[in-house]
Amino acid sequence: LPLNSSTSLEKNNVLFGERYLEKFYGLEINKLPVTKMKYSGNLMKEKIQEMQHFLGLKVTGQLDTSTLEMMHAPRCGVPDVHHFREMPGGPVWRKHYITYRINNYTPDMNREDVDYAIRKAFQVWSNVTPLKFSKINTGMADILVVFARGAHGDFHAFDGKGGILAHAFGPGSGIGGDAHFDEDEFWTTHSGGTNLFLTAVHEIGHSLGLGHSSDPKAVMFPTYKYVDINTFRLSADDIRGIQSLYGDPKENQRLPNPDNSEPALCDPNLSFDAVTTVGNKIFFFKDRFFWLKVSERPKTSVNLISSLWPTLPSGIEAAYEIEARNQVFLFKDDKYWLISNLRPEPNYPKSIHSFGFPNFVKKIDAAVFNPRFYRTYFFVDNQYWRYDERRQMMDPGYPKLITKNFQGIGPKIDAVFYSKNKYYYFFQGSNQFEYDFLLQRITKTLKSNSWFGC
């Protein structure tokens, strides 16, 4: 049995141990029969052993000194076992460009030091994966960094100074990915107090989908221990874990364009993520960039998406225009943004499912509005849906196969736009097809960048 004596100190230790094992190892306290603090059955003992094994302690099944010391050590609030069992397919971000926002700043540090610590913490993970992180100051970020004390809007209230230092949620919508830091700690840039950088590296690991590690050398080990931040490195276990989710940095080469470089406009292999008209202009989206082509003029200009719309993400995947309403819809993952008169509307992004897509649709490949029918066509993998913009609902009988109804197009497409009252321009890789929707056939085959005089 864990304890035989019933002194008040030991009673307190047992109660503390119970709470710890409930919080971090799933001990079901309601199933513990209690008689004068003596526990019948092995539930408590088994959980103590599980904890000792996970944290590298001598496995005794007793609340011995070293076990109680470990239980009192400052640590992450995320449970050690049965934690990251997420949605089917596993808790990972299904994209390589991830945004974060610092919601509020601890008064313990200069703002610049907080920014720097958080940026460097993200960098630790981007150095060993294909992931790219960018800080945004407004709008909805994938990962929200919050300093809070006590109850703060989730089920996991902080506990004052010491104990739980921080916690984070695995990837997902809403609270998913968010990292919360206990404001009752004293956050620092050094070894005094609690080092924000080291804690943030750990919490961002959770934000990216990692659970706790039982390797004491790993940054994902549950308890906090200061190490020299100038020589800090991820352990082999941390790297193995994160690369099992996202691959190594070389996977970047699979992305058409790494973080900073502007794609070569006349590269014969150039493809686009999304294309749409906006009035008399055509916008071509690629990674963090868009080109602006004014109809019938040879000149084009390249811009950062963030320079025109700071609250929008990079990697727009689909776009369409309803010119009569001066509206442009931009899509990425399962969200969309509405641009009116070239200004982002408030209260966006919204879920693509508000259009009526079934739950299995997680992103849109391409979209185009046809003003003649007042219908929008959404292309998803090898199928397409048709949406009635007047009635604001999907037309019955969809989805249909692209290849069946757009002769010569498909099975999948990257982008499409509507022009000259009768043509769709479909983009597939580095190829483009002019499609006459009245004749229902391809009338020209072009390179994707033919609009730029290449």
Epitope: E22, K23, Y25, G26, L27, E28, N30, V78, P79, V81, H82, H83, F84, R85, E86, M87, P88, P91, N103, N104, M140, L144, V146, A148, H152, G153, D154, F155, H156, H167, F169, G170, G172, S173, G174, I175, G176, D178, N347, Y348, P349, K350
Partner: antibody, heavy 122, light 103 residues
Framework: EVQLLESGGGLVQPGGSLRLSCAAS????????MHWVRQAPGKGLEWVSY????????HYADSVKGRFTISRDNSKNTLYLQMNSLRAEDTAVYYC???????????????WGRGTLVTVSS | DIQMTQSPSSLSASVGDRVTITCRAN??????LNWYQQKPGKAPELLIY???SLQSGVPSRFSGSGSGTDFTLTISSLQPEDFATYYC?????FGQGTKLEIK
């Protein structure tokens, strides 16, 4: 299609006990947090309790702490609420609800059952 | 402890009206706010999560906004099926509800 079906409600005397069940189908039950939420007649919603995917990590509202016990049997895809020392103010429709997340609950309920009525009266 | 206050507690409106319901927290809850719709005798249904994200299958006339302590649910053009009670919620705390009735 996700379905949640509560059962076990009924009339019970103050101080008595009742066990509610919620049969789940249409999703991988063992991957998600589950919750109980109640609604007294003509009143608003009140969260009661949640349980983690594996059966550990339980959490209770102060109003039921020490009297109610949430549990689950993943092999049977069933959620339970054992209610002891019942009081008149526990009279309500009890809903079971699925959390949108499978770890570290956010308390975002994407599917609800139809509810089962518990009446505590002498 | 965090508390959620919804206003108004009841509201009369006509089909086609634009309606706004507000929810206030007594401390910051960032964007961790959800909205549910409940019709008489039925279970609640999730409308909006994370303050402004529309749940799958919910019509686009519903929208949410806000962060920190102040949040709003807006129905841009009321439809007959929208007359119901609306609740805001974060973690284990619900607002007291707003009953939307036909004028």
């Amino acid at each position: 299609e996700v379905q949640l079906l509560e059962s076990g409600g009924g009339l019970v005397q103050p101080g008595g006990s009742l066990r509610l069940s919620c049969a789940a189908s249409g999703f991988t039950f063992s991957d998600y947090n589950m919750h109980w939420v109640r609604q007294a007649p003509g009143k608003g919603l009140e969260w009661v309790s949640y349980i983690g995917p594996s059966g550990g990590y339980t959490h209770y509202a102060d109003s039921v702490k020490g009297r109610f016990t949430i549990s689950r049997d993943n092999s049977k895809n069933t959620l339970y609420l054992q209610m002891n020392s019942l009081r008149a103010e526990d009279t309500a429709v009890y809903y079971c609800a699925k959390d949108i997340r499978g770890a570290y609950s956010s308390g975002l309920f994407d599917y609800w059952g139809r509810g089962t009525l518990v009446t505590v009266s002498s | 402890d965090i508390q959620m206050t919804q206003s108004p507690s009841s509201l009369s409106a006509s089909v086609g009206d634009r309606v706004t319901i507000t929810c206030r927290a007594n401390q910051s809850i960032y964007t961790y706010l959800n909205w549910y719709q409940q019709k008489p005798g039925k279970a609640p249904e999730l409308l909006i999560y994370a303050a402004s994200s529309l749940q799958s299958g919910v019509p686009s006339r519903f929208s949410g906004s806000g962060s920190g302590t102040d949040f709003t649910l807006t129905i841009s053009s009321l439809q007959p099926e929208d007359f119901a009670t609306y609740y805001c919620q974060q973690a284990g705390i619900f607002g007291q509800g707003t009953k939307l009735e036909i004028k």
